[in-house]
Amino acid sequence: EICGPGIDIRNDYQQLKRLENCTVIEGYLHILLISKAEDYRSYRFPKLTVITEYLLLFRVAGLESLGDLFPNLTVIRGWKLFYNYALVIFEMTNLKDIGLYNLRNITRGAIRIEKNADLCYLSTVDWSLILDAVSNNYIVGNKPPKECGDLCPGTMEEKPMCEKTTINNEYNYRCWTTNRCQKMCPSTCGKRACTENNECCHPECLGSCSAPDNDTACVACRHYYYAGVCVPACPPNTYRFEGWRCVDRDFCANILSAESSDSEGFVIHDGECMQECPSGFIRNGSQSMYCIPCEGPCPKVCEEEKKTKTIDSVTSAQMLQGCTIFKGNLLINIRRGNNIASELENFMGLIEVVTGYVKIRHSHALVSLSFLKNLRLILGEEQLEGNYSFYVLDNQNLQQLWDWDHRNLTIKAGKMYFAFNPKLCVSEIYRMEEVTGTKGRQSKGDINTRNNGERASCESDVLHFTSTTTSKNRIIITWHRYRPPDYRDLISFTVYYKEAPFKNVTEYDGQDACGSNSWNMVDVDLPPNKDVEPGILLHGLKPWTQYAVYVKAVTLTMVENDHIRGAKSEILYIRTNASVPSIPLDVLSASNSSSQLIVKWNPPSLPNGNLSYYIVRWQRQPQDGYLYRHNYCSKDKIPIRKYADGTIDIEEVTENPKTEVCGGEKGPCCACPKTEAEKQAEKEEAEYRKVFENFLHNSIFVPRPE
């Protein structure tokens, strides 16, 4: 039986009965918030073999092992993850071991096992046999291994039953509990699963199978399941569904999303039955189950019941997320806010058409209107008194409307009005008249030449760069010394720079009047020698990264024809030099024969240039005679050969803080103080833990349904 679409068992342990007939949970399984310690021994679900999304366990009192509950759970597919994880075991106060002895494969995602004070048998599981990459696993804050004394079956009797693998240079037995080994398939099976008797399964099987080389005997499928068979792809006239099975058109045509209160059915796209058309596609008509590409952003019409939508906060802007056509009027009144420009762009940046008018008033937090980055048409079907369809009044910090070199905006009907915008140059308004096609519609008083731009540098001279030099993490630039009519009016220069992967940034990107600014700023004093050109060394930059840079002269407010004179440069794009890449990630090696090693790795996180090739070096290691002098059946850990590397194991320091030998020097010493990098890493780690815990709480604590 397929159960789903995600099972949430909370508060009452008897809800576990819902799992009674499940063989596959199509979705997630949550078992959480059961605060009364219960006896779970009577609950056993041997039929459950697959969870298609993730398994989350959180604060279940009295549960000591998962092995009795789910003795045959073989695969967690991770089709959807919980914060990047397919298995989360968090704050399970009584859990002593995981015990999922039949768990063979976590197809996607990592594991997070954290804050389980009594949990052992963690170091005895080789997760690399279950997951593709173990580097993202997070196993922290459980019972210390030294207090666990984990023993695999048969070890004490000196008749070990489990197989050994190496983890972190430690060659040891692998088991889930004191009486359950971790199953490993013969090397002859390669990546294939195997039966209990170590016979290789069919290549389409995942996890395990009941008979060898038979695609109808799989416990789970590597790719897709259809009519009792594991198949590499869905057959004709069937469609992939929920990442693991094939369904027919009729099935797909009759299902609805349970997450929505509308009855917009599923669609078929690219061989998959899915809830929505993917990004960039739209349904091909109201009765259609198929998707067609959108021309440009996909249209989404939004309507305001009261006709006029007031945007006075990020929250009110949020309602317009994804809207491309707004039926009604926009009244923008943003007096304050944090990171307001980028937040508004996030929520309003797709709007292309406003059917009514746009009014911007008392928006002292705005420096630019570029957050409406796709607005191309104001229809003016409804206008303000006086026939205005674009109205800009009393915005103390507004300096730019849009970047008119890259903007095509039409105002179909109605006039424009501008007053009391002291930093908005009249030339900017006149430019808008030309672009929008409203020139000639405005009467004399509609654009006030005295109180618009009265406090701005409206007559700007251009500063020219004279030289640029780059290294891997530095840029040196110089520019012509600006000479205003009265040299005493020049105070200094400000250099603005930021990462710019594309050559499409403007001065006002991400900038608002409340201190948020996507540009880094550096002040540059005037060189004392009048003949020396001003310049700056920008350091601490990333290698092989394109930066945008511009310079502004800081001048006294020298009034000339009622306006201030200033100077600034064009935006210059400049790339730092390439550098050595960071190390390749997740290096794994395995032997597939007596004369071959297969080595796999992921690209470096910081390529610092265009990667052209990798260098793989290897060398033969002498067999370590030390390994033969140890009794492998003893409970002790296998001693690992230590190399003097000038650092000390922190755990050893706590035991005997005064007698450790530091590096090559004799004599007692204490743990070395943490470096800045280590402190930073610890801080980030703590932050990451908090973020996850918040995510967990926000996801699982939900209002009681009505």
């Epitope: 789903g4 679409p5 995600g6 949430d8 199509e26 979705g27 997630y28 009759n254 299902i255 609805l256 999303s257 349970a258 997450e259 929505s260 209160s261 509308d262 009855s263 917009e264 059915g265 599923f266 809830q275 349904r283 109201s286 009765q287």
Partner: nanobody
């Protein structure tokens, strides 16, 4: 408080027509999917037809395809079911239902669990 009131039921001869209406109040009608269900004496409640809010996409049970038509008027907050070529087996109590969010995943349009609000029903009797 959400309220759904069905009307338009009655006694009709086989082959005849009826038009059921369901007027909703207490909700933003234009954002909810809606459906008609029916329950004959001694039988399970079954889905007859459903309609989405945004696009007007429609769904029909095989037994009524080609005979029944579902529609809605968002301005009037009303859902309709036009029933033609009625058969005696269409005799049942007809209920109007409104979708609700119901956790994760999916369900079939004719599953009652996907609907959060229900009307009192209107009786349709088809005589032979």
């Amino acid at each position: 408080q959400v309220q759904l009131v069905e009307s338009g039921g009655g006694l009709v001869q086989a082959g005849g027509s009826l038009r059921l209406s369901c007027t909703a109040s207490g909700l933003t009608f234009g954002t909810f999917g809606m459906a008609w269900f029916r329950q004959a004496p001694g039988k399970e409640r079954e889905g007859v037809s459903a309609i989405s809010a945004s696009s007007g996409r429609t769904y029909y049970a095989d037994s009524v395809k080609g005979r029944f038509t579902i529609s809605r008027d968002n301005a009037k907050n009303t859902l309709y079911l036009q029933m033609d070529a009625l058969k005696p087996e269409d005799t049942a109590m007809y209920y109007c239902a409104v979708r609700s969010k119901n956790g994760a995943g999916y369900g079939f349009w004719y599953e009652a669990r996907l609907y959060g609000y229900w009307g009192q029903g209107t009786q349709v009797t088809v005589s032979s």
